[in-house]
Interface confidence: low
């Protein structure tokens, strides 16, 4: 007869490991007992369990509650056992020694491999601001056994770098994603992808990029200077900018206070029926936590009684 087993048994951490040992004997042969032991190199054999044809299963104290026979029906020639709830420390060499009648003793070895699936964590880098050079956007770390693979899935242009740290029973892999921040990256997903033989599918963690910026400011509303004449109703100036975080707007008049009746509504400055006292230099201030911008315009309210047209100057400053 001969023993049938596996060279390697692979399980995921926390799963039950079936350690196979089946005696394929000739007709009339019987298995008296099966002894299981752990036999790692450099250490003495440590008994797991003894499976006796008459007295049943005896489990050594070190494995109490963790070694069982497979559920019925059982073949009397099957000396396989279940090792419950495999942990990393169970990884190693195991031996089954089968005593048969009348053929004598047989033994076989197998290796138990315990996969530790990674539990990835994604850490965003420092705040991203337009104008920075190459900056860390995020780092992703995953530890497992064997070492996991850590990659990035994104449409954002960037560079990656990885490093690995070996521990006694596992390895930690950290991958960093660097980029040059630009406003077009705002809202773009950056996904860390972790692959491992102990995972049914890749694990993915997504980070949404936020890049602080503030666009140049400009003022609309003075495109046709002839519309800015005494008595006109509904005249308004609108300040144009964009930013992340969204900016706030403030209006002032450079050559004095805002005239009475002028309404400030966020990015818009609304005028009552125009009079000559509305002539002046108006400044739109745009700011967010990242930066601030100014844009100023000169308003000349025309008197239809006068023939000479007056010019409108637009100056933008930041």
């Amino acid at each position: 007869g001969e023993l049938e087993t596996s060279d390697v048994v692979t399980v995921v951490l926390g799963q039950d490991a079936k350690l196979p040992c089946f005696y394929r004997g000739d007709s009339g042969e019987q298995v008296g007992q099966v002894a299981w032991a752990r036999v790692d190199a450099g250490e003495g054999a440590q008994e797991l369990a003894l499976l006796h044809s008459k007295y049943g299963l005896h489990v050594s104290p070190a494995y109490e509650g963790r070694v069982e026979q497979p559920p019925p029906p059982r073949n009397p020639l099957d000396g396989s056992v279940l090792l419950r709830n495999a942990v990393q420390a169970d990884e190693g060499e195991y031996e089954c020694r089968v005593s048969t009648f009348p053929a004598g003793s047989f033994q076989a070895r197998l290796r138990l491999r315990v996969l530790v699936p990674p539990l990835p964590s994604l850490n965003p880098g420092p705040a991203l601001e337009e104008g920075q050079g190459l900056t860390l956007a995020a780092s992703c770390t995953a530890e497992g056994s064997p070492a996991p693979s850590v990659t990035w899935d994104t449409e954002v242009k960037g560079t990656t770098s990885s490093r690995s740290f070996k521990h006694s029973r596992s390895a930690a892999v950290t991958s960093e994603f660097h980029l040059v921040p630009s406003r077009s990256m705002n809202g773009q997903p950056l996904t860390c992808v972790v692959s491992h033989p102990g995972l049914l599918q890749d694990q993915r963690i997504t980070h949404i990029l936020h890049v602080s910026f503030l666009a140049e400011a400009s003022v609309r509303g003075l495109e046709d200077q002839n519309l800015w004449h005494i008595g006109r109703e509904g005249a308004m100036l609108k300040c144009l900018s964009e930013g992340q975080p969204p900016p706030s707007y403030n209006w002032t008049r450079l050559d004095g206070p805002l005239p009475s009746g002028v309404r400030v509504d966020g990015d818009t400055l609304g005028f009552p029926p125009l009079t000559t006292e509305h002539s002046g230099i108006y400044v739109c201030h745009v700011s967010n936590e990242f930066s601030s911008r100014d844009s100023q315009v000169t308003v000349d309210v025309l008197d239809p009684q006068e023939d000479s047209g007056k010019q409108v100057d637009l100056v933008s400053a930041s």
Partner: nanobody, 124 residues
Framework: EVQLVESGGALVQAGGSLRLSCSVS????????MGWFRQAPGKEREFVAR????????DYADSVKGRFTISRDNAKNTVYLQMNSLEPEDTAVYYC?????????????????WGQGTQVTVSS
């Protein structure tokens, strides 16, 4: 999004009992080792207990052995900490942790998943 939400913290007299619960969403807790840590005011965060993925294997800090019992209900994605014979020294914020590590005792806040914590106060 992964979330661990602890509940059950309270003010209790010395010698009393409490049961903490930790509900996990966004991941399959049954594949993870689950644990509890605690942090008393002015002290380092310390390991309390852990239960392995299948629920059969548990481990405790020496200071709580025999008084605390950790258990899990994989169907509900929940882990529990039954605390009996509470002492004033057990006063702390208790954190639920999910990980896969045999060395969960040495986990730091940058590793695994952590809850926000629940306050347990034991008065003498």
């Amino acid at each position: 999004e992964v979330q661990l939400v602890e509940s059950g913290g309270a003010l209790v007299q010395a010698g009393g009992s409490l049961r903490l619960s930790c509900s996990v969403s966004g991941l399959t807790a049954s594949r993870l080792t689950m644990g509890w840590f605690r942090q008393a005011p002015g002290k380092e965060r310390e390991f309390v207990a852990r239960v392995y993925a299948s629920g059969g294997l548990t481990d405790y800090a020496d200071s709580v052995k025999g008084r605390f019992t950790i258990s899990r209900d994989n169907a509900k994605n929940t882990v529990y900490l039954q605390m009996n014979s509470l002492e004033p020294e057990d006063t702390a914020v208790y954190y639920c942790v999910a990980g896969l590590w045999a060395d969960m005792r040495t986990m730091t806040s940058t590793r695994g998943y952590w809850g926000q914590g629940t306050q347990v106060t034991v008065s003498s």
